[in-house]
């Protein structure tokens, strides 16, 4: 007979699906790393549920997560970043479900920032530049970036360009004249580390010049 038979809450809990997903962010706060997890079912009752990570840690055997609303997270310098850690959902001392995960394979980079677009009249093009905090990091330095742009009126018609640098040139003739464009960028690990796309950068908005009727070229803005 189960030692938990008297506990109605736990009996119900054992019928639930405790599947969860996580991502890591390395050197997200100085030399501190973070690990963020959430249940895949947003409706799981998380009242008494905790997350714990054990293994592939420096100086300690296990660490407990902090809870914020429906997410669980750790910020620490103690990730070894070699080998797999065991991440468990727990009620008290009882583990409900566990996953063995190598934190270097679930990396989510920080979002790029300082996105801007400059029109070059003589070259008839737009130079897109942005920044990423990963240029200064020790671990996740090499990223692939996804620049997406669209005419503002075309809700879901995004054009995507993948690049490894933080500079892109868009030819004026490939864009509609006298139109408002939205552009944004995100990043994903591209060397040794594996994982997920970052959040999108804040969008940048720019207007393309009018067409100069006499020459068929666009007027500068």
């Amino acid at each position: 007979e189960s030692g938990y038979a008297q506990n109605g809450d736990l009996e119900d809990a054992e019928l639930d699906d405790y599947s969860f997903s996580c991502y890591s962010q390395l050197e997200v706060n100085g030399s501190q790393h973070s690990l963020t997890c959430a249940f895949e079912d947003p409706d799981v009752n998380i009242t008494n549920l905790e997350f714990e990570i054990c293994g592939a840690l420096v100086e300690v055997k296990c660490l407990n997560f902090r809870k914020l609303q429906e997410i669980y997270f750790i910020e620490t310098k103690k990730f070894l970043l070699i080998g797999k850690s065991n991440i468990c959902v727990k009620v008290g001392e009882k583990s409900l479900t566990c996953k063995k995960i190598d934190l270097t394979t679930i990396v989510k980079p920080e979002a790029p920032f300082d996105l801007s677009v400059v029109y070059r009249e003589g070259a008839n093009d737009f130079v897109v530049t942005f920044n990423t905090s990963h240029l200064q990091k020790k671990y996740v330095k090499v990223l692939m970036h996804d620049v997406a742009y669209r005419q503002e009126k075309d809700e879901n018609k995004w054009t995507h360009v993948n690049l490894s640098s933080t500079k892109l040139t868009l030819l004026q003739r490939k864009l509609q004249p006298a139109a408002m464009y939205e552009i944004k960028v995100r990043s994903i690990p591209d060397h040794y580390f594996k994982g997920f796309w970052s959040e999108w950068s804040p969008s940048y908005y720019f207007r393309t010049p009018e067409i100069n009727n006499s020459s068929g070229e666009m007027d500068p803005i």
Partner: nanobody
Framework: QVQLVESGGGSVQPGGSLRLSCATS????????MTWYRQGPGKTRELVAV???????TYADSVKGRFTISRDNAKNTMDLQMNGLKPEDTAVYYC???WGGGLNREPFDYWGQGTQVTVSS
Amino acid sequence: QVQLVESGGGSVQPGGSLRLSCATSGSIFSLATMTWYRQGPGKTRELVAVITWRGTTTYADSVKGRFTISRDNAKNTMDLQMNGLKPEDTAVYYCNVKWGGGLNREPFDYWGQGTQVTVSS
């Protein structure tokens, strides 16, 4: 569909202050990034301030030291305290809440309708 509602706009003299608020009509995933944008007369929409779930903030150069963004994750709200307002701050201010996807949550990108801020003597 989640609705974002901005409030707190109005008219103020140069040097004055306003506090904008953005409230959601539904539950927003706590990891979402919250952003204020603005669009001045005859201008393109521009970033004003960003706050991540961790509370990390970023500001446009033009508002640094004058504007402060904050959020309350428990209430799914975001505020923008605007001090030392200048005529060039005149614009419609929009709040935006964005999640790029992952952790089994679908991506979303919600916008408010905007609130007018006018700075004039």
